[in-house]
């Protein structure tokens, strides 16, 4: 069980909403995926994990913040602008785009709590939405009607 | 703004749920859904959200648990066993498999806390990993060595 340190105010502590505020403002959007400089990595393997066998392969990039729960998040980064041919596993097929799938994940930030006279009273948890890229997906390009 | 839900009530503090209620918005993926003529069909659309334009299309299924945070999680469910042809958007290509991408997401369960003499002292949050399927990915089948 996780008993969060002083995320609930103690007796007599000011429980104003200022103290335990939270925000649902998404963190600024991540940079669009760029194809990897090394063209040899833009291929679909016949073994290994899902992200390397995908015809829209991707790698993971660590995003660590010790004041956030979870502390470690991983962002997908597409290795190819287009999908890789199912036949060869290496040549790109311009009829398909490799696009990032995004998700707004609930995370919690540890923030100092302040008591009656502005004294530090442990830590509060601030809930936020954090934009992560989960994977790269091979899609048909949009046809604008 | 919101008060954190009674994860560590202190001595003498009123831990009634009225006091400790808080609001949130379910966190689905970013792109709004568009109508899909055949919502459960195995085809790759040329418009609409990523999950219907993918050549490994999927739908989302709600998983709701009122004692968990987030309360609403969405599991991807693949609509095709194989990938859809980039050319036609409808015929399946047996050279590619549509596979679920899984992720162990950090969630929090609300559990009763117990005080000094086993008395109920509000709620604690228990941190756990919960397996969710994020998307369906078009992959080359594994070649066993």
């Amino acid at each position: 069980y996780s008993h969060w340190p002083s995320c609930c105010p103690s007796k007599g502590q000011d429980t104003s909403e200022e103290l335990l505020r939270w925000s649902t403002v998404p963190v600024p959007p991540l940079e669009p995926a760029r194809p990897n400089r090394h063209p040899e990595s833009c291929r679909a393997s016949e073994d290994g994990p899902l992200n390397s066998r995908a015809i829209s392969p991707w790698r993971y990039e660590l995003d660590r913040d010790l004041n956030r729960l979870p502390q470690d998040l991983y962002h997908a980064r597409c290795l190819c602008p287009h999908c890789v041919s199912l036949q060869t596993g290496s040549h790109m097929d311009p009829r398909g785009n490799s696009e990032l799938l995004y998700h707004n994940q609930t995370v919690f930030y540890r923030r100092p709590c302040h008591g009656e006279k502005g004294t530090h009273k442990g830590y509060c948890l601030e809930r936020r939405l954090y934009r992560v890229s989960l994977a790269c997906v091979c899609v048909r390009p949009r046809v604008m009607g | 703004y919101s008060h954190w839900p009674s994860c560590c009530p202190s001595k003498g503090q009123d831990t009634s749920e009225e006091l400790l209620r808080w609001s949130t918005v379910p966190v689905p993926p970013l792109e709004p859904a568009r109508p899909n003529r055949h919502p459960e069909s195995c085809r790759a659309s040329e418009d609409g959200p990523l999950n219907s334009r993918a050549i490994s299309p999927w739908r989302y299924e709600l998983d709701r648990d009122l004692n968990r945070l987030p309360q609403d999680l969405y599991h991807a469910r693949c609509l095709c066993p194989h990938c859809v042809s980039l050319q036609t958007g409808s015929h399946m290509d047996p050279r590619g498999n549509s596979e679920l991408l899984y992720h162990n997401q950090t969630v929090f369960y609300r559990r009763p806390c117990h005080g000094e003499k086993g008395t109920h002292k509000g709620y604690c949050l228990e941190r756990r990993l919960y397996r969710v399927s994020l998307a369906c990915v078009c992959v080359r089948p594994r070649v066993m060595g």
């Epitope: - | 839900p5 749920e17 949130t24 379910p26 709004p32 299924e61 709600l62 009122l66 969405y74």
Partner: antibody, heavy 121, light 107 residues
């Protein structure tokens, strides 16, 4: 003002399909889950399923054995209920209902459409 | 699925009376219970959510109580406009389920 306006009454033959629409206005359509509830003559309310307009995520009542499909058109702020393989016992009023919520406490259908009468005979 | 059972199925009371309707769940649902009012020929309306919280615009003569498996809807002083069928609904687990309804009439 929040409003849910449903399509008109339908008369169908057994084995046919029906598609009922529910146009929402007065709030952010993508921000609230939409429920569908049926009321057969003289019967209790029966929950059919829900859909999150934001991602098309659904949950269905298995009592309908896969005959129900829920969809949305966010650009038109409209939710749809499709019921296949109709039988006489599907006769009733079909309601769409917006779901409000507050974590740890409630999920409640706070606004309802006027209902669509579907007659199967 | 969780079964919801209301009692009585119908009742008749006089204006000014205190009226009580009960709702029982087949398993514990904490406080995850709503009450709806459906007037004759009308659409259901949310009355009470989360066992005891009054929805906006609902008169204070309505109140709800209970926890676990047994719940009560009370009208402290019955008014003519309260003639309706009342439904309880659990949302502890999907699928949502409703009680069979209690039809309230004026004597």
């Amino acid at each position: 003002e929040v409003q849910l306006v449903e399509s008109g009454a339908e008369v169908k033959k057994p084995g046919a399909s029906v598609k009922v629409s529910c146009k929402a206005s007065g709030y952010s359509f993508s921000g609230y889950t939409m429920n569908w509830v049926r009321q057969a003559p003289g019967q209790r309310l029966e929950w059919m399923g829900l859909i999150n307009p934001y991602n098309g995520g659904t949950s269905y009542n298995q009592n309908f054995k896969g005959r129900v499909t829920l969809t949305v058109d966010t650009s038109a702020s409209t939710a749809y209920l499709e019921l296949n393989s109709l039988r006489s016992e599907d006769t009733g009023v079909y309601y769409c209902a917006r779901e409000d919520f507050d974590s740890w406490t409630y999920f409640a259908m706070d606004y309802w459409g006027q209902g669509t009468l579907v007659t199967v005979s | 699925d969780i079964q919801m059972t209301q009692s009585p199925s119908s009742l008749s009371a006089s204006v000014g009376d205190r009226v009580t309707i009960t709702c029982s769940a087949s398993q514990g649902i904490s406080n995850y219970l709503n009450w709806y009012q459906q007037k004759p020929g009308k659409v259901p309306k949310l009355l009470i959510y989360y066992t005891s919280s009054l929805h906006s615009g609902v008169p204070s003569r309505f109140s709800g109580s209970g926890s676990g498996t047994d719940f009560t809807l009370t009208i402290s002083s019955l008014q003519p406009e309260d003639v309706a069928t009342y439904y309880c609904q659990q949302y502890s687990k999907l699928p949502y389920t409703f009680g069979q309804g209690t039809k309230l009439e004026i004597k």
